[in-house]
């Protein structure tokens, strides 16, 4: 509607690790003569309507989501409604509603995309001594509190991918922070290098671990 | 229980003006949008604006603009629909509607509570 | 203007399981639309059935159920009873305002 006022929010989901502060950005146009008095600003849960933080009857209201929750105070009157989330976890993932009541009232939502790097695979063999080419080997590879859910790829020491006999599974503890096991079988050549790479889809981070078999004895390349 | 209770039914001369009330009663804490939805014979549902009485803040749809005036009174727990330079096509029953602008409840129903409707007839 | 697409009749059998769609002209529907389905029987006012996409309003029977198919909001009613024979509205949610669909005329034979 004509004069309504326009809520403006980021259209690509706002990106923050685990662990940092997010700030969900939302402004508005004030017109001339615009005072905080005038202004009722509210922050929700997109979905259920939940209150996350408000600002009504001229003053901050403070944080109705777990008190990690504030506004910047002296920018409000500039029309910036941005909310700060501090120390974002999984389970704050998901879209937030700007709501701005001005003479009118308009409202706009934000993504927060949660994430987490995953650390370095370690590398397990099974079995791991006595191994001669034609044998079968179990290689595991092993990434931990990463987020969202990894993409795994396996490759040979030329390079080329190994799809078949993988078997990937990824369990979330507590904090919704992913471990993935991957678990290759494998029938040992001459010798050969075996590579993982866990994708964190979101943070485009890599993270690799191989191990590389010679027959006689096994080496694990150092730790990067 | 939520209920909103509208005014009676209303017969106007074209160029006049109508005003219907919207009294909710039971429950109304919160943050509430009164959404006005009027609706011609044979046609379908129809938004006309809506307002926020803890704010007193109001928004109009575009065709509305200019003719219609929404105001609420917080101490009665009442909404208004002024609708002015009636037509002959603004015979109609109009509705007000509640929805949360924050759900108390921690779930969004949305304009889960209606009004009985006002008939409203245009006519010389 | 914001154009909202419904089937304009649907018609079903007792028992059976019926989707009425609601599409934007805006594009694909998002639980920011918070989708409502309105069901209107002749003399009656309307009455809320879904709001937020998929919440039941109370005294709404668990067989309406609201969601998201492909793009558009949709309204599931499983095992469809007599009674359900109306008009089915949806309402979409934009920054500040509500636009209503046509309406779907359910019809139960």
């Known amino acids: 509607p004509t004069g309504a006022v326009e809520v403006q929010v980021p259209e690509d989901p706002v990106v923050a690790l685990v662990g940092t502060d997010a700030t969900l950005r939302c402004s508005f146009s004030p017109e001339p003569g615009f005072s905080l008095a005038q202004l009722n600003l509210i922050w929700q849960l997109t979905d259920t309507k939940q209150l996350v933080h408000s600002f009504t009857e001229g003053r901050d209201q403070g944080s109705a989501y777990a008190n990690r929750t504030a506004l910047f105070p002296d920018l409000l009157a500039q029309g910036n409604a941005s909310l700060r989330l501090q120390r974002v976890r999984v389970a704050d993932e998901g879209s937030f509603t700007c709501f701005v009541s001005i003479r009118d009232f308009g409202s706009a939502a934000v993504s927060l995309q949660v994430a987490a790097p995953y650390s370095k695979p370690s590398m397990t063999l099974e079995p791991n001594k006595d191994l001669r080419p034609g044998d079968t080997v179990t290689i595991t590879c092993s990434s931990y509190r990463g987020y969202p859910e990894a993409e795994v790829f396996w490759q040979d020491g030329q390079g080329v991918p190994l799809t078949g006999n993988v078997t990937t599974s990824q369990m979330a503890n507590e904090q919704g922070l992913f471990d993935v096991h991957s678990v290759l079988r494998v029938v040992l050549g001459a010798n050969g290098t075996y590579s993982c790479l866990v994708r964190n889809p979101v943070l485009q981070q890599d993270a690799h671990g191989s191990v590389t078999i010679t027959g006689q004895p096994m080496t694990f390349p150092p730790e990067a | 229980q939520v209920q909103l209770v509208q005014s009676g039914a209303e017969v106007k001369k074209p160029g006049s003006s109508v005003k219907v009330s919207c009294k909710a009663s039971g429950g109304t804490s919160g943050v509430a949008l009164i959404n006005w939805v009027r609706q011609a014979p044979g046609q379908g549902l129809e938004w006309m604006g809506g307002i926020i009485p803890l704010f007193g803040t109001a928004n109009y749809a575009q065709k509305f603009q200019g003719r219609v005036t929404i105001t609420a009174d917080e101490s009665t727990s009442t909404a208004y629909m002024e609708l002015s330079s009636l037509r002959s096509d603004d015979t109609a029953v109009y509705y007000c509607?509640?929805?949360?602008?924050?759900?108390?409840?921690?779930?969004?129903?949305?304009?889960?509570?209606w009004g009985q409707g006002t008939t409203v007839t245009v006519s010389s | 203007d914001i154009q909202m697409t419904q089937e304009p009749s649907l018609t079903t059998s007792p028992g059976g399981t019926v989707t009425l769609t609601c599409r934007s002209s805006t594009g694909a529907v998002t639980t920011s639309n918070y989708a409502n389905w309105v069901q209107e029987k002749p003399g009656q006012a309307p009455r809320g059935l879904i709001g937020?996409?998929?919440k039941r309003a109370p005294g709404t029977p668990a067989r309406f159920s609201g969601s998201l198919i492909g793009g558009k909001a949709a309204l599931t009613i499983t095992g469809v009873q007599p009674e359900d024979e109306a008009i089915y509205f949806c309402a979409l949610w934009y920054s500040n305002l509500w636009v209503f669909g046509g309406g779907t005329k359910l019809e139960i034979k």
């Open positions: 509607a509640r929805d949360q602008v924050v759900a108390t409840s921690g779930v969004n129903f949305g304009m889960d509570v």
């Open positions: 937020g996409t998929n």
